[in-house]
């Protein structure tokens, strides 16, 4: 049977086992979760793309899973992140009363797997998947992120962090999902302040990274959502990923 | 409690040489980065040198780059300064300082009493 | 390196407010942190982080920090808070303002 050829990678082999076993170990680790049915978790995220059409999924599609998914994380910390994903999951591992996204169940089920189905066929597609910029925007991987990220976004209160990797030539960037989503979907009446976490490469780069034009430009952006904006210059990530590697120093209890 | 106790300052001619001692104690000292912060008679606080908490990274001030050293030895719990080529601007109380703020800020918790060096002929 | 700059001296009557400046180019996008030096004394650490005060440091002590200038504010001042303060920030390196005399008058 011909098959759709798509340029971006297949599905993550095992798709289905690991999702139901992140589904138990998340469950298992976190109690106010366990309630949680994770069978009908699968099937819910499976019904999402399954014999539909790998361009035409919608946020409607994953509305079944984010029911089951709904979860009640601390508005006000909440850590989003762009283009340094590592270094927001390690400091979060440490810091453990601050969440990204991939913290909640719904991201920590997703983080880094690929998936997409095949129109009026309950095959998953494990040779290839529609990739964002050469074949569709409404792609499962997409959507997904994009909803949840959403929600995520909209959840928040107070003073919320970014993380932003400050050796990349954009920092900030309009098209990243914290970029086209999360910024536009911060709600002003909850949210005081977008306080940004610039990460310097090294301790030898003694730039304001905080006046990079990306950053004035999502200043502008937030302040005219009516959100107070700060920024901050984060120049040691050398000691900080040698408290990810010893959680227990005594040094490592963050002051923020 | 955290204690740091400086010792080997004193009365040094110019060109001349010194090893200032800090022993820790109350923390464990190898989870820590520490440093030398110096203060001239009368004048403000200045950043000397910095170590990270192995000793792999050290850092130093322009002024003294090249003619200080900062070690440690996590097994004494002791932090040093070997100061070499000593001018009279060198002239300071200097204090052994512990940085804590891991992770997103830099700050000096806990300080020691301060040793005397002079440079003078 | 960032330059920080802090008015040598301030006078404040006790149980008034002391604010004390610490300006330099941005220094909103520093983390700044407060030492109190009494004389002959090691500095102490009053606040970190522009605004968070370490335990063992009294209330009246507080911090704000936002675009070229970092305030130390001290409220309902007391005899016992004549010293020098420093502000510090990193940018890489160490960097420390000049230091304010507080004086508490009467």
């Known amino acids: 049977r011909w098959r759709q050829q798509w340029s971006g990678p297949g599905t993550t082999k095992r798709f289905p086992e690991t999702v139901l076993a992140r589904c138990v170990k998340y469950t298992e680790i976190h109690p106010e979760m366990r309630h949680v049915d994770c069978q009908s978790v699968w099937d819910a995220f499976k019904g999402a793309f399954i014999s539909k059409h790998p361009c035409n999924i919608t946020e409607e599609d994953y509305q079944p899973l984010m029911k089951l998914g709904t979860q009640t994380v601390p508005c006000n910390k909440i850590l989003l992140w762009s283009r340094i994903k590592d270094l927001a999951h390690q400091f979060t591992q440490v810091q453990r009363d601050m969440f990204t996204l991939e913290d909640t169940l719904l991201g920590y089920l997703a983080d880094d797997l690929t998936w997409c189905g095949e129109f009026n066929t309950s095959k998953i597609n494990y040779q290839s998947c529609p990739d964002w910029r050469k074949d569709c925007s409404n792609n499962p991987v997409s959507v997904f992120w994009k909803t949840v990220s959403r929600r995520f976004a909209e959840a928040a209160c107070d003073v919320v962090h970014v993380m932003l990797n400050g050796s990349r030539s954009k920092i900030f960037d309009k098209n990243s999902t914290f970029g086209s989503v999360e910024v536009h979907n911060l709600q002003p009446e909850k949210v005081q302040t977008l306080e940004a976490w610039v990460i310097h490469g090294g301790r030898e780069d003694s730039r304001d990274l905080c006046q990079d034009p990306t950053i004035k430009e999502l200043e502008s952006i937030i302040s005219k959502r009516n959100i107070q904006f700060s920024c901050k210059n984060i120049y040691r990530p050398d000691k900080f990923l040698q408290c990810v590697k010893n959680p227990e120093d005594s040094s490592c209890t963050s002051e923020i | 409690q955290v204690q740091l106790v400086e010792s080997g300052g004193g009365l040094v001619q110019p060109g001349g040489s010194l090893r200032l001692s800090c022993a820790a104690s109350?923390?464990?000292?190898?989870?820590?980065?520490m440093n030398w912060v110096r203060q001239a008679p009368g004048k403000g606080l200045e950043w000397v040198s910095g170590?990270?908490?192995?000793?792999?990274?050290?850092y130093y001030a322009d002024s003294v780059k090249g003619r200080f050293t900062i070690s440690r030895d996590n097994s004494k719990n002791t932090l040093y300064l070997q100061m070499n080529s000593l001018r009279a601007e060198d002239t300071a109380v200097y204090y052994c300082?512990?940085?804590?703020?891991?992770?997103?800020?830099?700050?000096?918790?806990?300080w020691g009493q301060g040793t005397l060096v002079t440079v003078s002929s | 390196d960032i330059e920080l700059t802090q008015p040598p001296s301030v006078s404040v009557a006790p149980g008034q407010t002391a604010r004390i400046s610490c300006s330099g180019d941005?220094?909103?996008?520093?983390?700044v942190s407060w030492y109190q030096q009494k004389p002959g004394q090691a500095p102490v650490l009053v606040i970190y982080?522009?605004?968070n005060r370490p335990s063992g440091i009294p209330e009246r002590f507080s911090g704000s920090n936002s675009g070229n200038t970092a305030t130390l504010t001290i409220s309902g001042t007391q005899a016992e808070d004549e010293a020098d303060y420093y502000c510090?920030?990193?940018?890489?390196?160490?960097?420390f303002g000049g230091g304010t005399k507080l004086t508490v008058l009467g």
């Open positions: 109350g923390f464990t000292f190898s989870s820590y980065a």
């Open positions: 982080s522009d605004s």
């Open positions: 510090q920030s990193y940018n890489g390196t160490y960097v």
């Open positions: 941005n220094i909103g996008h520093y983390y």
């Open positions: 170590i990270s908490s192995w000793g792999s990274s050290t």
């Open positions: 300082a512990r940085e804590d703020g891991s992770y997103m800020t830099d700050y000096f918790a806990y």
